[in-house]
Amino acid sequence: TSSASSSSSSAPFLASAASAQPPLPDQCPALCECSEAARTVKCVNRNLTEVPTDLPLYVRNLFLTGNQLAVLPAGAFARRPPLAELAALNLSGSRLDEVRGGAFEHLPSLRQLDLSHNPLAYLSPFAFSGSNASISAPSPLVELILNHIVPPDDKRQNRSFEGMVAAALVAGRALQGLHLLELASNHFLYLPRDVLAQLPSLRYLDLSNNSLVSLTYVSFRNLTHLESLHLEDNALKVLHNGTLAELQGLPHVRVFLDNNPWVCDCHMADMVTWLKQTGVVQGKDRLTCAFPEKMRNRVLLELNSADLDCDPILPPSLQTS
């Protein structure tokens, strides 16, 4: 393995040897592999407990996956001079449980950030905005990947996890330029109502594999650029008129609704009517009733109003125990 200081183009990645000398601008940190040609540094599965201080200035793509970082403090990537080229930062699976305010400050070109598969017990409201001002400087982030960041139940704070994530997404209106947001596999029971209003540039939103039961209080109206909305593998029972009208009004959207336990009773009539005429839903003929038992496995598109009844609610005097 070549030492970090010998920048040879013959080997695409140079693994660093520990050095007592002060870091050189283009030195490769210990336990990392560097390619100046690819502008890439990989410090992967090395059980690192902190972000290397001596990252080369040329780094554009930084992989810090599979480590044991635990805490990402304010200014975790702040350097003098700054890492002005860093555009893609992958911190997935690095056992992070705390991301503090300003953790990604001084990264003027950071377009893609992946924090997936970290059990985030604490995500500062200012993790992405960098300041507690009501309107922050816009973040350069375009893609934010936050799949499976829910901590185990015993590590959760008192406040709702949904609320904690939402606060970080809306703080300072910093993420107005965000195009892609992935929030899959986070056990979300609901989506806080103001989040999407603060993310008007979204083109791709992944909320799959959560526990969303209803979208009644969620507004998609201002997401006029939205192209893909992933709602597969949730606990949705029905989509109501307001939601249907909003989705139909989005000019470019494709909606994915597979694997939701649709309840095919009288409340489903509007959704069935909409499904029959919309081009918005992908694979719509796969949507099948889960409840009630007599409707189980029926294709939603093949239902008609006569099929969709609700058991009458008996007045208390007629109910039996």
Partner: antibody, heavy 116, light 107 residues
């Protein structure tokens, strides 16, 4: 009551094709997907593919994409699976099953024997 | 694609004995369904959505579990319960996958 009727046996020669049938009754044929499942002797169940009788849309297990072709005849409420380029590996039992989340009704199965 | 692993592959129980078999998923699934297949017959849906008994299934059967670990239990084995039991993941989109089966014999 819901019934899925399959012929008990089919005997065909190697290299030939066969079209297995599954006649549905007791429910609205177009309201449920129809699935096909393979079971080799003393082995487990393997999903082959499914078809929406209403519009003919199909999905296939990658392993069977070049082996099986699913079709339906709505007028007779019958689902078909054609198996091509048959070999001894294809000799086994094939079931049709009505399904969505699960497979709530199954045919009795057709035992296919490929032999010269 | 989720892989389902059933254990044990083969087991035997005496009449009246309690029986438990398991189905382990390679990644988290919401529910599991169970099918019973007696020798020489087609499979029958036996338990669905992890714990609901199909109409006609004796109440000595029960299902439980969540995430990646599920089980089927017979509180008191009877001769007619001798069969192979398959688990299947809860999904309405392809592919549908089954476990390898647990063959339950009567002693």
């Amino acid at each position: 009551q819901v019934q899925l009727q399959q012929p008990g046996t089919e005997l065909v020669k190697p290299g030939a094709s066969v079209k297995l049938s599954c006649k549905a009754s007791g429910y609205t044929f177009t309201s449920y997907w129809m699935h096909w499942v393979k079971q080799r002797p003393e082995q487990g169940l393997e999903w082959i593919g499914n078809i929406n009788p209403s519009n003919g849309n199909t999905n296939y297990n990658e392993r069977f994409k070049s082996k099986a072709t699913l079709t339906v005849d709505k007028s007779s409420s019958t689902a078909y699976m054609q198996l091509s380029s048959l070999t001894s590996e294809d000799s086994t039992v094939y079931y049709c099953a009505r399904g969505g989340w699960d497979f709530d009704y199954w045919g009795q199965g057709t035992t296919l024997t490929v032999s010269s | 694609q989720v892989v389902l692993t059933q254990s044990p592959a083969i087991m035997s129980a005496s009449p009246g004995e309690k029986v438990t078999m398991t189905c382990s998923a390679s990644s988290s699934v919401r529910y599991i369904h169970w099918y019973q297949q007696r020798s020489g017959t087609s499979p029958k849906r036996w338990i669905y959505d992890t714990s609901k008994l199909t109409s006609g299934v004796p109440v000595r059967f029960s299902g439980s579990g969540s995430g990646t670990s599920f089980s089927l239990t017979i509180s008191s084995m009877e001769a007619e319960d001798a069969a192979t039991y398959y688990c299947q993941q809860w999904t309405s989109k392809p592919p549908w996958t089954f476990g390898g089966g647990t063959k339950l014999e009567i002693k």
